[in-house]
């Protein structure tokens, strides 16, 4: 061993200076009578070594590194030997920080494992091997006087928690607990906790269960859930308060908290929820009124609230078959009376024969918004209800009466845009209670079964905007019927388009007769097309060889036209424009030549 390094300290604060000396023994001088000692930190040569020969013939080099900024590095003492660097000795240097004070020390008593689990935050990285020890002692009072020490608890490497087993614990008696951190640069201690293990007990949560429905118990109300919880048996004798949280399974709703609740609720009804909605529920508990920690939330229970009977108004309308007046087609529309009006599973139309107390005869049961049934000869009225699993809506009476009320007048309709029509009228006197407005395709596509209808509850209304099932270029029939207390007025109807189409083509022009200065033209009108407004007029255009244009407007019933004042032996271009309120279309161009002066007329 030729050389030996000694250092002021192998472990220092990061950034602190360090001094090292390297001594080469005399018996190594054969390498070089005046060897030059070099220093290397890691892979980098370090200048600044001060070398001297000592009295005993040994060579010494001393170096001071002003700042050790590496957390770990090897310092080497070397000699140049040939072309290579020969390492004589090396030492490991470490730099870091003394341990910070561990903080946020907290403990939980786990009754299942019978141990006190304490955890802490170790603080910033020291870059040095640092050991943590959980230290504790038993105390009769408030930890001012130290009783028996408890065996140190040393966590596994890298862990910031430790378990004190039951044999070292005394329940209902205070313990002093703290964490000590230690490394080569120093020792630190956390603030001391003084606690009774039972005051930091963390219980297991109860198990949530749904209530088994019993025959004598009333079913839960709409928007309510019946549930119960089974306390965690080992914690049964600990007074606790609990809280429940719930949220709908669908949507982004946050948890709603309910509490405090008793641990021992054998059954609990949770209300104020949305009807017919699936909910997720969880419960947790805490020792109370004595101190403790909240348990974790229990596993989720998923329950569905009962639905409420439909709360709707049913607007109704009916029609009799012309061939069989006892066959009635009844239509209805549910109008919600509340924000959550309940799910509708179906509808029932029924009739109660007079003299048969309690007897109700169903005429139809459907999920549709209409039904056709045969009205018994003595029946003047039926009842309509909406139903679901929770019950029925209030019955809506439907009275079948003659049209005895006054009619409305001046029914008219106009397009608002391609998808809506405004229908207006003058109300009769006296005011009706409301109106039924029906609309559907007019002839030739008319069909009673495909009509859309709406109830206007305001008897003073003078019009209604039709926005449903309106398409452009279709002819609609609109029927309005006034409704009175026990009867109705005669229905009125009007036809209208929301948007009409321009003619798709103008008739082809044909030359019938021609002369020197005239030409007789004719055409066959296009047959009327559904969705296209009727022609308002034709315009005929003709242009001579000099590009002079002439035109004449003809009425829509015209079938031909004679052009007069033409030049003999001249070329003309002629076309017909067919026009309606929705636009105009040109025919193809007819080109003709008038006869020469000496030629005879053509007929």
């Amino acid at each position: 061993e030729c050389g030996h390094i000694s250092v002021s300290a192998p472990i220092v604060h990061l950034g602190d200076p360090i001094t090292a000396s390297c001594i080469i023994k005399q018996n190594c001088s054969h390498l070089d009578p005046e060897p030059q000692i070099l220093w290397r930190l890691g892979a980098e040569l370090q200048p600044g070594g001060r070398q001297q020969r000592l009295s005993d013939g040994t060579q010494e080099s001393i170096i001071t590194l002003p700042h050790l900024n590496h957390t770990q590095a090897f310092l080497s003492c070397c000699l140049n030997w040939g072309n290579s660097l020969q390492i004589l000795d090396q030492v490991e240097l470490r730099a870091g920080y003394p341990p910070a004070i561990p903080h946020n020390l907290s403990c939980l008593m786990n009754l299942t494992t019978s141990s006190l689990i304490c955890q802490w935050e170790p603080g910033p990285e020291t870059h040095l091997p640092t050991s943590f020890t959980l230290k504790s002692f038993k105390s009769r009072g408030n930890c001012q006087t130290q009783g028996d020490s408890i065996l140190d608890c040393v966590p596994k490497d890298g862990q910031s928690h430790c378990c004190i087993p039951r044999k070292h614990l005394l329940l209902y008696q205070n313990m002093g607990i703290w964490v000590q951190a230690e490394n080569a640069l120093g020792t630190s201690m956390s603030p001391q906790l003084c606690l009774d293990p039972m005051d930091v007990v963390k219980l297991e949560p109860p198990m949530l269960r749904t209530m088994d429905p019993s025959p004598e118990a009333a079913p839960p109300q709409a928007g309510c859930l019946q549930l119960c919880w089974e306390p965690w048996q080992p914690g049964l004798h600990i007074n606790q308060k609990c809280e429940l949280r719930h949220k709908p399974q669908r949507g982004e709703a946050s948890w709603a908290l309910v509490g405090p609740l008793p641990l021992e609720a054998l059954q609990y009804e949770l209300c104020g929820l949305l009807p017919a909605t699936a909910y997720t529920l969880q419960i947790r508990c805490i020792r109370w009124p004595l101190p403790g920690h909240w348990s974790d939330w229990s596993p989720s229970l998923e329950l569905r609230t009962t639905e409420r009977a439909p709360t709707v108004r049913l607007d109704t309308w009916w029609r009799q078959r012309q061939l069989d007046p006892r066959t009635v087609q009844l239509f209805w529309k549910p109008v919600p009376l509340e924000e959550d009006s309940g799910r509708i599973q179906g509808y029932v139309v029924s009739w109660r024969p007079s003299g048969q107390a309690g007897a109700i005869l169903p005429l139809c049961n459907t999920t549709e918004l209409s039904c056709t049934f045969h009205l018994p000869s003595e029946a003047q009225e039926v009842a309509l209800v909406a139903y679901n699993s929770a019950g029925t809506s209030r019955p809506t009476p439907v009275v079948f009466s003659e049209s005895r009320g006054p009619a409305l007048t001046r029914l008219h309709a106009m397009a608002r845009d391609p998808h809506s029509l405004w229908v207006g009228w003058e109300p009769p006197n006296p005011w009706p209670q409301g109106y039924v407005i029906e609309w559907g395709l007019g002839p030739p596509s008319a069909s009673n079964s495909n009509k859309t209808w709406r109830m206007e509850q305001n008897g003073r209304a003078t019009g209604f905007l039709l926005k449903e099932n309106i398409r452009p270029f279709q002819l609609y029939e609109i029927i309005v019927t006034p409704l009175y207390q026990d009867t109705m007025g005669p229905s009125q109807h009007v036809y209208a388009y929301s948007q009409e189409m321009a003619p798709s083509h103008a008739p082809e022009l044909h030359l019938k007769h021609i002369g020197k200065t005239w030409a007789q033209l004719e055409w066959v009108p296009e047959p009327p097309e559904l969705g296209k407004s009727p022609l308002t007029h034709y315009t005929i255009f003709w242009t001579n060889a000099q590009n002079q244009s002439f035109s004449a407007i003809l009425n829509a019933s015209s079938r031909g036209f004679v052009l007069h004042g033409l030049e003999p032996a001249s070329l003309y271009h002629i076309h017909l424009m067919a026009a309606s309120q929705a636009g105009a279309t040109n025919s193809t161009v007819l080109t003709l030549m008038t006869l020469t002066p000496e030629g005879s007329e053509l007929h």
Epitope: L111, T112, T113, S114, R166, K167, L171, M198, P231, Q233, P234, L236, H237, I238, N239, P262, L263, E264, A265, L266, R287, P289
Partner: antibody, heavy 118, light 107 residues
Framework: EVQLLESGGGLVQPGGSLRLSCAAS????????MGWVRQAPGKGLEWVSS????????PYADSVKGRFTISRDNSKNTLYLQMNSLRAEDTAVYYC???????????WGQGTLVTVSS | DIQMTQSPSSLSASVGDRVTITCRAS??????LNWYQQKPGKAPKLLIY???NLQNGVPSRFSGSGSGTDFTLTISSLQPEDFATYYC?????????FGGGTKVEIK
């Protein structure tokens, strides 16, 4: 000082009824579970029933289920055991006890003797 | 239901002896095991709760150990006032159950 004082024991014919009472003092009665434990002559201890601090939970031993009813009146600091359809095997000293948070019987009354015999 | 088995059912010992009584549960009960002492004609008295916690006022010669299914009550140096019957009891759940008892008599 915690005190539990049982009363209501005595001689009763098989099929008869008896109501035991336990007057508690020296602690906040409404915060603790209470219970009844019995000991037949010359035999070991047998748990009979317990009741939670508010009275909502009342477990029973199979041997007395359906015949005995435990109850409490927190305003009177009193625990009760209503015993119906008594049998000869119900003969025992009945102890009232205060329970701790870990289910231990922390304090016991002096006991009251119930004798079921014709 | 959880059964508690105590052994021995009786033992004879002298003052100053170290006495050990065991209690076995038919299934794991964590540390929910309590020990009671009863003297003839008297009510039972709690000695140890939660397997190893000494009840206030109980001499330190009494100690408890064990967890799960096997538990031990130890009297380190038997005193004249310790001659009595000792019972174990599980309190992890209902129905609550006691061991059959161990009678400690003077040798």
């Amino acid at each position: 000082e915690v005190q539990l004082l049982e009363s209501g024991g005595g001689l009763v014919q098989p099929g008869g009824s008896l109501r035991l009472s336990c007057a508690a003092s020296g602690f906040t009665f409404s915060l603790y579970w209470m219970g009844w434990v019995r000991q037949a002559p010359g035999k070991g201890l047998e748990w009979v029933s317990s009741i939670s601090s508010s009275g909502g939970v009342t477990p029973y031993a199979d041997s007395v289920k359906g015949r005995f009813t435990i109850s409490r009146d927190n305003s009177k600091n009193t625990l009760y055991l209503q015993m119906n359809s008594l049998r000869a095997e119900d003969t025992a000293v009945y102890y009232c006890a205060k329970l701790g948070e870990l289910g231990q019987f922390m304090r016991w009354g002096q006991g009251t003797l119930v004798t079921v015999s014709s | 239901d959880i059964q508690m088995t105590q052994s021995p059912s009786s033992l004879s010992a002298s003052v100053g002896d170290r006495v050990t009584i065991t209690c076995r549960a038919s299934q794991g009960i964590s540390s929910y095991l309590n020990w009671y002492q009863q003297k003839p004609g008297k009510a039972p008295k709690l000695l140890i709760y939660y397997a190893s916690n000494l009840q206030n006022g109980v001499p330190s010669r009494f100690s408890g150990s064990g967890s799960g299914t096997d538990f031990t009550l130890t009297i380190s140096s038997l005193q004249p006032e310790d001659f009595a019957t000792y019972y174990c009891q599980q309190s992890i759940g209902y129905p609550g159950s006691f061991g059959g008892g161990t009678k400690v008599e003077i040798k």
